[in-house]
Interface confidence: medium
């Protein structure tokens, strides 16, 4: 992927809207939308006052760890759906899109240098462990996906792209 493709706001916007769409199709869906197990996902809460003052490398650690856990969670959701007796087609479509979207975002972040950033800060080893929550429905899973992209990922790429422009 071109190194700064993710710095084009339209690129991230596409994934944000996909994530929101996925969340919207699960609104009011109970029958098809239970995961039947608790899946660990990243806690997406952002204290923006503190985040704004965090080293970009520390932000990268949080984003990279969160993205890895979220990808794992969505893949687990996909597996559960495949194994269910009658997967609901719209849900299947959005889960597949989320899996593909997270793969692409991982590639785009790697191209931006997020992985290097996440390894290089001296305090990376002593960084606080990633806060997690659990999701037991696809609605919650998609909500976390949407929140993660809208929050930490967008805030980090905005900062990393600005830093790279200097």
């Amino acid at each position: 992927a071109p190194p700064r493709l993710i710095c084009d706001s339209r690129v991230l916007e596409r994934y944000l809207l996909e994530a929101k769409e996925a969340e919207n199709i699960t609104t009011g869906c109970a029958e098809h939308c239970s995961l039947n197990e608790n899946i660990t996902v990243p806690d997406t809460k952002v204290n923006f006052y503190a985040w704004k003052r965090m080293e970009v490398g520390q932000q990268a650690v949080e984003v990279w760890q969160g993205l890895a856990l979220l990808s794992e969670a969505v893949l687990r959701g996909q597996a559960l759906l495949v194994n269910s007796s009658q997967p609901w087609e719209p849900l299947q479509l959005h889960v597949d899109k989320a899996v593909s979207g997270l793969r692409s975002l991982t590639t785009l972040l790697r191209a931006l240098g997020a992985q290097k950033e996440a390894i290089s800060p001296p305090d990376a080893a002593s960084a606080a462990p990633l806060r997690t929550i659990t999701a037991d429905t696809f609605r919650k899973l998609f909500r976390v996906y949407s929140n993660f992209l809208r929050g930490k990922l967008k805030l980090y790429t905005g900062e990393a792209c600005r830093t790279g422009d200097r």
Epitope: N47, A50, R53, N147, L155
Partner: antibody
Framework: QVQLVQSGAEVKKPGSSVKVSCKAS????????ISWVRQAPGQGLEWMGG????????DYAQKFQGRVTITADESTSTAYMELSSLRSEDTAVYYC????????????????WGRGTLVTVSS | SYVLTQPPSVSVAPGKTARITCSGD??????VHWYQQKPGQAPVLVIY???ERPSGIPERFSGSNSGNTATLTISRVEAGDEADYYC???????????FGGGTKLTVL
Amino acid sequence: QVQLVQSGAEVKKPGSSVKVSCKASGGTFRSYAISWVRQAPGQGLEWMGGIDPISGFADYAQKFQGRVTITADESTSTAYMELSSLRSEDTAVYYCARELYYPGTWMAVMAYWGRGTLVTVSS
Amino acid sequence: SYVLTQPPSVSVAPGKTARITCSGDNIPEYYVHWYQQKPGQAPVLVIYRDNERPSGIPERFSGSNSGNTATLTISRVEAGDEADYYCQVFDESSWHWVFGGGTKLTVL
């Protein structure tokens, strides 16, 4: 039940400063950021800035940068907003609002509001 | 910085449905919150994250966000719903909370 009690109305001269207080009760003070929002007579809401009591980090809207200082005193569960170099356009009701993470939000929203403090700037 | 545009006023008869709009560039990309403010009172959060209702807010209040417009819908409007309504987003490019200009809802 969360309550935010603000200091009383103030009349100030142009060029002077005003410091408005906001005392919180109910819930843990340090767990939630406090924002300050103002509303000029007959006008809309305008975010001025806010503070995270845990870190003491404050952030300000561009428009007020350099003129506003937001602080928090954990021992008294009170947040303060000081606005300097006052001019007549600063005549407004100043609200403090406590931010809260609702289920499923990545960012806290302004869930609880004080009743507001009217600041009148007049010579 | 980001701009949210609301109509200055909306009028509706009691029992009917009121729709208050809030437009901005790529607004579906943002999460929109709505506040109600009655004369002489502090604002009250009525919808957060596009379409979620805080506890204590009647089901008559709902929200949506698609196209280039976020909408606050109040069904079966009552006289007590007469107030100013403000939309709000967090604009992370400027790291600021942004409010719309407000819409005065009049119940005829």
